[in-house]
């Protein structure tokens, strides 16, 4: 059997660190057998069998010029093997971050904090941080550790499914290369890392007869579980084309009527979501949707979405805000106290 322990990585490759002494091992001989060493492609002897180093080649203070393939041979000239030297560094603790797009699952991503230059893999696991009793710090078997399954195709991500929203978890990401291993432990709670995906299906429509109104509607992100316990709240921003500043409102449901749009100008609208009890952070903004207020006159017919009549108004009418409604069962929000000098729709 070979005297050379096979490091993790491709066969026939041995590893060392720049600036350090490196020992190469001749794989096809018995431990201690004297061998001769050559650099592949160079005929001069690097180290003879009389070196006293047996089956090993010692390179003092290796540098990048030492990388490459070496040939070892026995006393009678038989090939003992070829060895490729690759230089690099031991792993450093990886950079790890975790995020959750819903309240049941979370994912963690990682990246090396230093480039090792060597073949690298990552071991990922997690456990639930649970204390059995006031005086006990022993771990319960139900707290893990469990593997954190990694995405296929080498994406630097693993996903924990079926997490408990109120529990704390300890994530272990260990970077492994042929020169060692280094671990990063990260404590996470779903509440703090929750960041929903942005709302979907954002639509912006004009309100016929109201040149300063736009009606925006959207849906929950598909990744948010369809259960009523954890709702989302929303933030909506809008601005006219070429206008640098956004106006922000917090709608009560899944739609909002903008009443101070600039007549005749297209408007950009975007929405963001957050857990309704303020866990975690706001989502990124949805892709912008565009709409332009209606330029037509007051409609004669009753619109399909509500029985309306209109009246001219000079002073803004102040309405009581409608009572809050659950986000999952929104109703059209037809009245808004921010109406200014325009036709105001009033409930019949």
């Amino acid at each position: 059997s070979s005297p050379c322990p096979q490091a993790w990585g491709p066969p026939g490759v041995q590893y060392g660190q720049p600036g350090r002494s490196v020992k190469l091992c001749c794989p096809g001989v018995t431990a201690g057998d004297p061998v001769s060493w050559f650099r592949d492609g160079e005929p001069k002897l690097l180290q003879g069998p009389d070196s006293g180093l047996g089956h090993e080649l010692v390179l003092a203070q290796a540098d990048s010029t030492d990388e490459g393939t070496y040939i070892c041979q026995t006393l009678d000239g038989a090939l003992g093997g070829t060895v490729t030297l690759q230089l690099g560094y031991p792993p450093a603790r990886p950079v790890v971050s975790c995020q959750a797009a819903d309240y049941e699952n979370f994912s963690c991503t990682w990246s090396p904090s230093q480039i090792s230059g060597l073949p690298t893999r990552y071991l990922t696991s997690y456990r639930k941080k649970t204390v059995l009793g006031a005086d006990s710090q022993r771990r319960s078997p139900s707290t893990g550790p469990w593997p954190c399954p990694q995405d296929p195709l080498g994406a630097a991500r693993c996903v924990v499914h079926g997490a408990e929203f109120w529990s704390q978890y300890r994530i272990n990401v260990t970077e492994v290369n042929p020169l060692g291993a280094s671990t990063r432990l990260l404590d996470v709670s779903l509440q703090s890392i929750l960041r929903p995906d942005p709302p979907q299906g954002l639509r912006v429509e004009s309100v016929p007869g109201y040149p300063r109104r736009l009606r925006a509607s959207w849906t929950y992100p598909a990744s948010w579980p369809c259960q009523p316990h954890f709702l989302l709240k929303f933030r909506l921003q809008y601005r006219p084309a070429q206008h640098p500043a956004w106006s922000t409102v917090e709608p009560a449901g899944l739609e909002e009527v903008i009443t101070d749009a600039v007549a005749g100008l297209p408007h950009a609208v975007r929405v963001s979501a957050r857990d309704f009890l303020d866990a975690g952070t706001w989502s990124t903004w949805s892709p912008e949707a565009w709409g332009t207020p209606s330029t037509g006159t007051i409609p004669k017919e009753i619109p399909a979405w509500g029985q309306l009549h209109t009246q001219p108004e000079v002073e803004p009418q102040v309405d009581s805000p409608a009572p809050p409604r659950p986000s999952l069962q929104p109703h059209p929000r037809l009245l808004d106290h921010r109406d200014s000098v325009e036709q105001v729709a009033v409930l019949a």
Partner: antibody, heavy 117, light 107 residues
Framework: QVQLVQSGAEVKKPGASVKVSCKAS????????MHWLRQRPGQGLEWIGN????????HYNQKFKDRATLTVDKSTSTAYMELSSLRSEDTAVYYC??????????WGQGTLVTVSS | DIVLTQSPATLSLSPGERATLSCRAS??????LHWYQQKPGQAPRLLIK???QSISGIPARFSGSGSGTDFTLTISSLEPEDFAVYFC?????????FGQGTKLEIK
């Protein structure tokens, strides 16, 4: 015991090619390098090249690089050296030699190649 | 290519005498120099490797020395079978090259 038996003498015309064989026995063929050398009448030795024991990797003397081809047939433990575009100055005894990477420990008996019009 | 120059071209000595053969390299080759003996009608035989390392089966009267550019093969007491041609060979860089030979003849 180690034996390298080369093919018989050849007479070739200028411009022709010659292929010399070297059948090895008495050792594990794929453990050792095979070298090819030649010795012109009354002259010194010239190294043509070598071929690796397991991967058939070759090193050639640039002087022969474009004309010499070294091959092995592992199934019959035979090495071959083909020299093309022969000229009169290629008249020589051609040797195969088992060795390590750079030394020649066991030699064949030699094959005389005569190039003459 | 590294050129090896052997001297003398011919050395005439009697059995029992000490023979000293020289090989000089056109550049420093450390100890990557080897010595061969060739008798008429025979293939060469390896005598010394890496300037001074002996070869199994070669009589102890053959020894080598030197490093860098100057090398010596010494036969401490000549036997009749030692009269032959001696070649040095370098393995410091490709192509592997030989000296032109020293013919050791009986005086």
């Amino acid at each position: 015991q180690v034996q390298l038996v080369q093919s018989g003498a050849e007479v070739k015309k200028p411009g022709a090619s010659v292929k010399v064989s070297c059948k090895a026995s008495g050792y594990t063929f794929t453990n050792y390098w095979m070298h090819w050398l030649r010795q012109r009448p009354g002259q010194g030795l010239e190294w043509i090249g070598n071929i690796g024991p397991s991967d058939s990797k070759t090193h050639y003397n640039q002087k022969f690089k474009d004309r010499a081809t070294l091959t092995v047939d592992k199934s019959t433990s035979t090495a071959y050296m083909e020299l093309s575009s022969l000229r009169s100055e290629d008249t020589a005894v051609y040797y195969c030699a088992r060795g390590d990477y750079v030394l020649f420990t066991y030699w064949g008996q030699g094959t005389l190649v005569t190039v003459s019009s | 290519d590294i050129v090896l120059t052997q001297s003398p071209a011919t050395l005439s000595l009697s059995p029992g005498e000490r023979a000293t053969l020289s090989c000089r390299a056109s550049q420093s080759i450390s100890n990557n120099l080897h010595w061969y003996q060739q008798k008429p009608g025979q293939a060469p035989r390896l005598l010394i490797k890496y300037a001074s390392q002996s070869i199994s089966g070669i009589p102890a009267r053959f020894s080598g020395s030197g490093s860098g550019t100057d090398f010596t093969l010494t036969i401490s007491s000549l036997e009749p079978e030692d009269f032959a041609v001696y070649f040095c060979q370098q393995s410091y860089s490709w192509p592997l090259t030989f000296g032109q030979g020293t013919k050791l003849e009986i005086k």
